[in-house]
Amino acid sequence: QAAPFPELCSYTWEAVDTKNNVLYKINICGSVDIVQCGPSSAVCMHDLKTRTYHSVGDSVLRSATRSLLEFNTTVSCDQQGTNHRVQSSIAFLCGKTLGTPEFVTATFCVHYFEWRTTAACKKDIFKANKEVPCYVFDEELRKHDLNPLIKLSGAYLVDDSDPDTSLFINVCRDIDTLRDPGSQLRACPPGTAACLVRGHQAFDVGQPRDGLKVVRKDRLVLSYVREEAGKLDFCDGHSPAVTITFVCPSERREGTIPKLTAKSNCRYEIEWITEYACHRDYLESKTCSLSGEQQDVSIDLTPLAQSGGSSYISDGKEYLFYLNVCGETEIQFCNKKQAAVCQVKKSDTSQVKAAGRYHNQTLRYSDGDLTLIYFGGDECSSGFQRMSVINFECNKTAGNDGKGTPVFTGEVDCTYFFTWDTEYACVHHHHHH
């Protein structure tokens, strides 16, 4: 049986059940290569409390549909006289990066995971030439996830003192320049994730090969190498390589630019101080507030919730967007869709789409940007579920009793962007990270 998601096959992936202190290793096309789980385990569970290993999915006993992968085992789960077997179930949804498998829950018999990934899309519009896993768990099983830094188009410029060259990078995947008509970036060779531009020439100095690694709790490393043979004439016979070290800052701060810290014989070392390198619980919340010792800040957007069936309205030229954030109030136009953001076509108000649901909510504060994300909306033709990204700005003089109002700024591939100036986005900092 052919592998259902070939782009996910090259790696062993990790997921964590934080509540029970369990680490899962997942290899969807082969086995995870952990002796304690046996030679054919596709999903290996490591219980760190009891220091035991169990195979909860066998690569030989795999069944697949376009959106669901199940790994059975021969192990009985002894559930009141039934002959059920322990199994793992991975639900796949379309995403814009390779993404990460997320542990959902475990019953007595079944271990459930969800994975938003380009591999599950109906169209190839989000697929990279080359992409590697972009997250890692530290020794305390805390997740560090650089997926939000991945650019689907364009690149980051590395701060370098050399006026004659420009070094462009992407994170965990190659640079897509197709949407850029006229800049230097357009000359970058396909597949490169680190592109060096000198004058009118562009050179591939690194492609992603291995996934993100953790070297210390707050330092993550990504390595790019130039795959193809044939040395560049300015590299003194060496093969180019790029090492990017992502550093979680010791306290809250604005984002910084990736900086070139060393360069020798086409070996480039880059340091990037960014809060995205910190563990995810430091940056994100599933509620509308971020506060406490863990996050070093106090943010509470719950006063923006609308009561009594009213919504914020944002004009999007062809569409009207109805928003009801930080609550579970149904938007009247989007009845029974559980939408936090509802898109209604002006010319035909029967055309209504959920552009993100209120129970699929993430509040993120990272590198000085405060963002509320609603995902899991109605599907687009690519298979991607509509989502909304609301970028908040602090404005102490915002109208509407300080609440302000969301402004639609654009749409890209079924992701809807808004900005919202409000006094409730004014962040209060603590200093004890």
Partner: nanobody, 123 residues
Framework: DVQLVESGGGLVQPGGSLRLSCAAS????????WGWFRQAPGKEREFVAA????????SYADSVKGRFTISRDNAKNTIYLQMNSLRPEDTAVYYC????????????????WGQGTLVTVSS
């Protein structure tokens, strides 16, 4: 692709003010960085100011810091450059540009350009 149209240039006395506008159309959200550049006669094109579309993060050339302010109106897909305390050396053609490169002020990293609007500071 992105189309950019500047307006608001003109003749102004030293110490005066002008507000330049740049209207963007096309798939504007695929660009992350919006910049104003200027080119005086016989000189290279130089960076003036930049802003990111998704947030209010800005950067300025040292020569205009404290005098010029870049801003944007997302609802109108428009970028502005408010120029105060103008000096004769600010005389130039001002260009609006868009880039898919983050953290750049280099004009060669900007792939989409407007046609420019002339600002003349003279008494």
């Amino acid at each position: 692709d992105v189309q950019l149209v500047e307006s608001g240039g003109g003749l102004v006395q030293p110490g005066g003010s002008l507000r330049l506008s740049c209207a963007a159309s096309g798939r504007t959200f695929n660009t992350y960085n919006w910049g104003w550049f200027r080119q005086a006669p016989g000189k290279e094109r130089e960076f003036v100011a930049a802003i990111r579309w998704s947030s209010s993060k800005t950067s300025y050339a040292d020569s205009v810091k404290g005098r010029f302010t870049i801003s944007r109106d997302n609802a109108k897909n428009t970028i502005y450059l408010q120029m105060n305390s103008l000096r004769p050396e600010d005389t130039a053609v001002y260009y609006c540009a868009a880039s898919i490169v983050d953290f750049t002020t280099n004009p060669s990293h900007f792939g989409s350009w407007g046609q420019g609007t002339l600002v003349t500071v003279s008494s």
